[in-house]
């Protein structure tokens, strides 16, 4: 058993049929010695008397809010949550496996630039009695500060018969150094509590590996006189790190015909303009990636050719 | 470069960008491969890193690029020695067309561009002997190449910025 926060305790249980459970001793936080009784949750049933209460915690029915009383008045509370371990593996019932970029990916994180700011998100099908808290640091043995905001419900989607909820959090490294080479990874830890079930999820990454620029902006097409060719230009996204002479992007451009089956030639360039043949009904697209480190490509920015 | 002269920024830019390409072709990104799953994330913590105080940021380069260039050169020599060591020459054998050979030569080429003959900056202690098991050696190659990718990315940014803003 360990204390999650004041008056909230997590009991770690090996979860298998007929498991013996965990013996827990609760102590009433009071100078009083006599006439103390204990109850669980709203039930008025007295579980025991005395300053301490010893219980065997085996299942969710044994978890909940234990209260010690004297003379009809509550003296202190202890909320017991359960953290299940099945076959040596902590349970992951609350969050959905996003399976990208690999199996057992419950938290996904992205950064738009090297400023030390990043967003993490996760998915669940649970809609009620659910709370999350997030902690983050750079490195684990001698952690450096990362400040995370409040967790927000960022999207709701219908998937077949189920509703899926996306939660996200934004974090910022306290003393970010955008130009340096990261040596220690960022650690993100999410505590999830659903009713009386406690779970924790972690992710470890370097900012450089989760970079995904915003799409290029200001796509413009300028037809060239007496030619089927078009001069296309675009700009770095506003959210990308500066100066661009240092934090450079590379671009992938393509012209996509109306039919998705049509062959599309992709051209890679470090410039912010190109000359292409842009047929009627086709569209021109461009995406960006860090020029020197193969992190994710941005989403496509597109503009119709006509 | 030693003693305050300027490097051939444009040449360094070209060669450092080539290094980035080679480092990624030697060890392509595969989303589901997470080296930390194999434990011992400290393995490559003794390689040189370009850190916050090394003056490799745009402002530091403007003030005095020498600190940063010295740091980059130390790192290039360190990695060049690693790629020529038993970690890469021992079992398992590299594929005949492995990019590691080119990568090794390019690291040497860039370090020499930063220090013409006759000048010698002190270099960092070269790493200890490689592990005995082929799988351990392969794991170490992965870690070294991932670490090299991060190092040469910063070096390439430095030279790109230098070529654009500090060239005479």
């Amino acid at each position: 058993i360990w204390e999650l926060k004041k008056d909230v305790y997590v009991v770690e249980l090996d979860w298998y049929p007929d498991a013996p459970g965990e013996m827990v001793v609760l102590t009433c936080d009071t100078p009083e010695e006599d006439g103390i009784t204990w109850t669980l949750d709203q039930s008025g049933e007295v579980l025991g008397s005395g300053k301490t209460l010893t219980i065997q915690v085996k299942e969710f029915g044994d978890a909940g809010q234990y209260t010690c009383h004297k003379g009809g008045e509550a003296l202190s509370h202890s909320l017991l949550l359960l953290h299940k371990k099945e076959d040596g593996i902590w349970s992951t019932d609350v969050l959905k496996d996003q399976k990208e970029p690999k199996n057992k990916t419950f938290l996904r994180c992205e950064a738009k630039n090297y400023s030390g700011r990043f967003t993490c998100w996760w998915l669940t099908t649970i809609s009620t009695d659910l709370t999350f808290s997030v902690k983050s640091s750079r490195g684990s043995s001698n952690p450096q500060g990362v400040t995370c905001g409040a967790v927000t419900l960022s999207a709701e989607r219908v998937r077949g018969d189920n509703k899926e909820y996306e939660y996200s959090v934004e974090c910022q490294e306290d003393s970010a150094c955008p130009a340096a080479e990261e040596r220690l990874p960022i650690e993100v830890m999410v505590d999830a509590i659903h009713k009386l079930k406690y779970e924790n999820y972690t992710s470890s990454f370097f900012i450089r590996d989760i970079i995904k620029p915003d799409p290029p902006k200001n796509l413009q097409l300028k037809p060239l006189k007496n030619s089927r060719q078009v001069e296309v230009s675009w700009e770095y996204p506003d959210t990308w790190s500066t100066p661009h002479s240092y934090f450079s992007l590379t671009f992938c451009i393509q012209v996509q015909g109306k039919s998705k089956r049509e062959k599309k030639d992709r051209i890679f360039t470090d410039k912010t303009s190109a000359t292409v043949i842009c047929r009627k009904n086709a569209s021109f697209s461009v995406q960006a990636q860090d020029r020197y480190y193969s992190s994710s490509w941005s989403e496509w920015a597109s503009v119709p050719c006509s | 470069v030693p003693g305050g002269s300027s490097p051939a920024w444009a040449q360094c830019q070209q060669l450092s960008q080539k290094l980035c390409t080679l480092a990624w072709s030697a060890h392509p990104l595969v989303g589901h491969m997470d080296l930390r799953e194999e434990g011992d994330e400290e393995t490559t913590n003794d390689v040189p890193h370009i850190q916050c105080g090394d003056g490799c940021d745009p402002q530091g380069l403007r003030d005095n690029s020498q600190f940063c260039l010295q740091r980059i050169r130390q790192g290039l020599i360190f990695y060049e020695k690693l790629l020529g060591s038993d970690i890469f020459t021992g079992e398992p054998s590299l594929l005949p067309d492995s990019p590691v050979g080119q990568l090794h030569a390019s690291l040497l080429g860039l370090s020499q561009l930063l220090q013409p003959e006759g000048h010698h900056w002190e270099t960092q202690q070269i790493p200890s002997p490689s592990p005995s098991q082929p799988w351990q050696r392969l794991l170490l190659r992965f870690k070294i190449l991932r670490s090299l990718q991060a190092f040469v990315a910063v070096a390439a940014r430095v030279f790109a910025h230098g070529a654009a803003t500090l060239s005479p």
């Epitope: - | 491969m33 194999e38 398992p92 054998s93 492995s98 990019p99 190659r141 992965f142």
Partner: nanobody, 126 residues
């Protein structure tokens, strides 16, 4: 799910040659490492050879086949080959093609894998 299908096994005289092929169903081929194991009746599984494209790309052979067997691949065809020359009776076994996509070859060199084919029988008569 990666599926691996081996072919090319058969009966051969000692000193002869065989070429085994293994086709991988998925296009995870070049991000995996591919290899061959063998198992003779009543014996432990034995590592034969592996090829991978990470860490600079690598090839590795088990001690008992070094200099006689050659592993190669055709990435365009998602196929890995095992050329077996100077075959000996002790090379008789079921030969399995294996893929290591999670650890890109480290598992193969440690003697395990993510996926394995059904196997093809190689019999070397004296």
């Amino acid at each position: 799910e990666v599926q691996l299908v081996e072919s090319g096994g058969g009966l051969v005289q000692a000193g002869g040659s065989l070429r085994l092929s293994c086709v991988a169903s998925e296009r995870t081929f070049s991000s995996s490492a591919m290899g061959w194991f063998r198992q003779a009746p009543g014996k432990e599984r034995e590592f034969v050879a592996a090829i991978g494209w990470s860490g600079g790309g690598f090839i590795h052979y088990g001690d008992s086949v070094k200099g006689r067997f050659t592993i190669s691949a055709d990435n365009g065809k998602n196929t890995v080959y095992l050329q077996m020359n100077s075959l000996k009776p002790e090379d008789t076994a079921v030969y399995y093609c294996a893929a290591d996509s999670r650890l890109r070859g480290i598992a193969l060199l440690k003697g395990s894998y993510d996926y394995r084919g059904q196997g093809t029988q190689v019999t070397v008569s004296s």
